[in-house]
């Protein structure tokens, strides 16, 4: 027989399968072009002196062989003997050690015997009821096959699965989707219900984010408010990089993580917008203003859990920027302005009352006055900071009043409310005799000290009942006592007190009389 | 569904060369193979060659062989076969029909084997 030629004779060893676990398996044959085929096996087992023959029976019985020698594949033409046209039985038979190693049969009609293509270009991934489904379109005039998947992790090794048939123009698969590690996979595709059949290769790597994107373990600092009012919001440690299977190392589009920034501007809510999202290596400056920031980690799947931080308001406080004036038509305050066409946000809200009791208004954009101020108004019917207590006053500016980052703080400081010179009227004035000409005048704070630094100063007036002569003594905002001195005996004093703001003067308290005795002596 | 026409047929003098085409239309990326038959009058039709689409592997009925060529042209949708016809023989005369198969059993020379049949296109060789 000639080599190229399928050998119709008996075949040149004896006819007995030795039933061996070692042999020829997982026989393989297809058309490799318009007239040629092949045919390639695996052989499991030592292979020194090993002959492998690939044996052919045809629809008619007769029956031939090819020598292979050593070689696991084989290729012959259509004009070797063997029927293309036709279906044909195939099986390998190798003679080694003087016995007869046989593989697996596969019968399959050789000139549609194509090997396919692999899944190319675009491949689909997406979420469907807790697994993976990939999606791709069927290479061309490829309908019809068997598809498996393989997928590793980082930390495990290929493991195979089963698509199941495809009889579209379209083909997908499901697939297992891991929670919390990143996987790739890999398809691969043979012809439809074609016994042996030659698998394609691989299809380039697919990778896959874990379900739940990783939780960002990230660390923040916020920096002090500078001249301008700003903050500087600072990353102190990166969000950890996914681990990717090996497959996936270097350019890996699907895994790819989105962390992004969330600031929640708590402080203002009159503002048009509370939010805004940034990319996370873009730091922000902030206001003073309290914040909520959450980093969201995001992938091809949606976002995953967020890590939320509260950045506390700066209560650095301005002791003097601050004017308020008080006529009869209402209040207005006066700042340091800003610059040219400024929206302000004044924000107040009671001291010790729970910071969702703030309350603000926005000014429309404002140029500064001649005098380089500032202006906000409201009148008392309005009931802005009305009630006799401490207010807790930011003021807030933007050019951009429509972008959150651009907030700055201008001033915050502390402003008693309503009629504060009646209400801030020291009350328990009482008089101890301290000495021959001198007395101890004492007094309960003024509600103003509940407000720091609105009282200036207590001031202190003695009136001689006899004479009508009046002194003042001014004592210090801390102090709720005074030592009147050089007083005479037998002589009708009265005492009062006042408490002062920087822009007001405070309402006397009720006269309280006094006289120090005359000392008898024996 | 796929819809297949010929065209390119005509006269032509003994030892003269033909070009026909068949443009399938339709569902194509669903077909594996198309081929070309040809039919006399009180005849069978009769297998001239066919070609594997995804690869280009061709397959010619022995009458034909060496002398006729397939070759096939994919775009989006549609795919064109072409069947070169050189050194023709007054025995080459008949109506040529394209047809297309979407599966990947039986024998391509039966008429059988395929599910989409062109309407025809008369070559007549004239001597």
């Known amino acids: 027989c000639r080599t190229s030629e399928c050998c119709f004779q008996d075949p040149p060893y004896p006819d007995a399968d030795s039933g061996s676990a070692s042999g020829p398996r997982d026989l393989r044959c297809y058309r490799i072009s318009s007239d040629r085929y092949e045919c390639s096996w695996q052989y499991e087992g030592p292979t020194a002196g090993v002959s492998h023959f690939l044996r052919c029976c045809l629809s008619s019985g007769r029956c031939c062989y090819f020598a292979a020698g050593s070689a696991t594949r084989l290729q012959f033409s259509d004009q070797a003997g063997v029927s293309v046209l036709y279906t044909v039985t195939l099986w390998v038979e190798s003679w080694a050690r003087n016995q007869t190693e046989k593989s697996p049969e596969v019968t399959l009609q050789l000139y549609n015997s194509v090997k396919y293509e692999p899944p190319l270009g675009d491949i689909k991934v997406s979420k469907l009821a807790g697994q993976l489904r990939m999606e791709w379109e069927t290479p061309d005039n490829q309908v019809g096959a068997e598809v498996q998947f393989r997928h590793r992790t980082p930390s495990s090794p290929w493991k195979l699965g089963d698509c199941g048939p495809q009889d579209d123009d379209t083909e997908s698969c499901l697939c297992p989707l891991e929670m919390n590690v990143a996987q790739e996979f890999q398809l691969r595709r043979r012809q439809l219900g074609s016994q042996g059949s030659s698998w394609s290769k691989w299809s380039s790597p697919v990778c896959v984010p874990p379900e739940n994107p990783p939780q960002p373990q990230v660390r923040f600092s916020v920096e002090q408010l500078g001249q301008d009012g700003r903050r500087r919001l600072t990353l102190k440690e990166q969000p950890t990089q996914l681990e990717l299977p090996e497959g996936c190392q270097g350019l890996a589009p699907g895994t790819e993580v989105t962390y992004r920034l969330q600031l929640h501007m708590l402080s203002c809510p009159c503002k048009a917008k509370a939010t805004r999202t940034l990319h996370l290596g873009k730091m922000p400056y902030l206001s003073g203003a309290a914040y909520n920031v959450a980093v969201i980690s995001s992938n091809q799947f949606g976002p995953g859990l967020n890590q939320t931080w509260h950045i506390p308001a700066d209560t650095h406080t301005e002791p003097v920027a601050l004017n308020i004036s008080v006529g009869t038509n209402g209040t207005t305050m006066y700042w340091p302005a800003r610059a040219q066409s400024m929206t302000y946000c004044i924000e107040w809200q009671p001291v010790g009352q729970d910071g969702g009791l703030a309350t603000c208004s926005l000014t429309a954009p404002q140029d500064p006055d001649p005098a380089g101020m500032a202006t906000y108004s409201w009148s008392r019917e309005s009931g802005a900071m009305g009630q006799e207590k401490c207010y807790y006053i930011t003021i807030f500016a933007s050019a951009h009043p429509e972008k959150l980052t651009l907030w700055s703080t201008v001033l915050s400081t502390y402003h008693f409310g309503g009629n504060a010179s009646a209400a801030g009227t020291p009350h328990h004035v009482s008089v101890k005799n301290h000495s021959l000409d001198s007395v101890s005048v004492d007094w309960a704070p003024s509600l103003l000290s509940t407000c720091p630094g609105v009282l200036k100063e207590y001031v202190v007036r003695c009136r001689d009942e006899d004479s009508k002569q009046v002194s003042e003594h001014p004592v210090q905002p801390t102090e709720t006592q005074v030592t009147l001195s050089g007083l005479r005996a037998g002589v009708a004093y009265t005492v009062q007190v006042r408490a002062d703001t920087a822009w007001l003067r405070g309402v006397w308290s009720q006269p309280q009389r006094f006289s120090i005795e005359v000392q008898v002596s024996d | 569904e796929v819809q297949l026409v010929e065209s390119g047929g005509g006269l032509v003098q003994t030892g003269g060369s033909l070009r026909l085409s068949c443009a399938a239309s339709?569902?194509?990326?669903?077909?594996?193979?198309m081929g070309w038959f040809r039919q006399t009058p009180g005849k069978e039709r009769e297998f001239v060659g066919e070609?594997?689409?995804?690869?280009?592997?061709?397959?010619?009925a022995d009458s034909v062989k060496g002398r006729f060529t397939i070759s096939r042209a994919n775009a989006k949708n549609t795919i064109t076969m072409y069947l070169q016809m050189n050194s023709l023989k007054s025995e080459d005369t008949a109506v040529y029909y394209c047809?297309?198969?979407?599966?990947?059993?039986?024998?391509?020379?039966?008429?059988?084997?395929?599910?989409?049949w062109g309407q025809g296109t008369q070559v007549t060789v004239s001597s």
């Open positions: 047809a297309a198969r979407q599966n990947w059993s039986g024998n391509p020379t039966r008429t059988n084997e395929y599910e989409y």
């Open positions: 339709g569902r194509t990326p669903s077909i594996i193979a």
């Open positions: 070609i594997i689409l995804s690869k280009g592997f061709t397959y010619y």
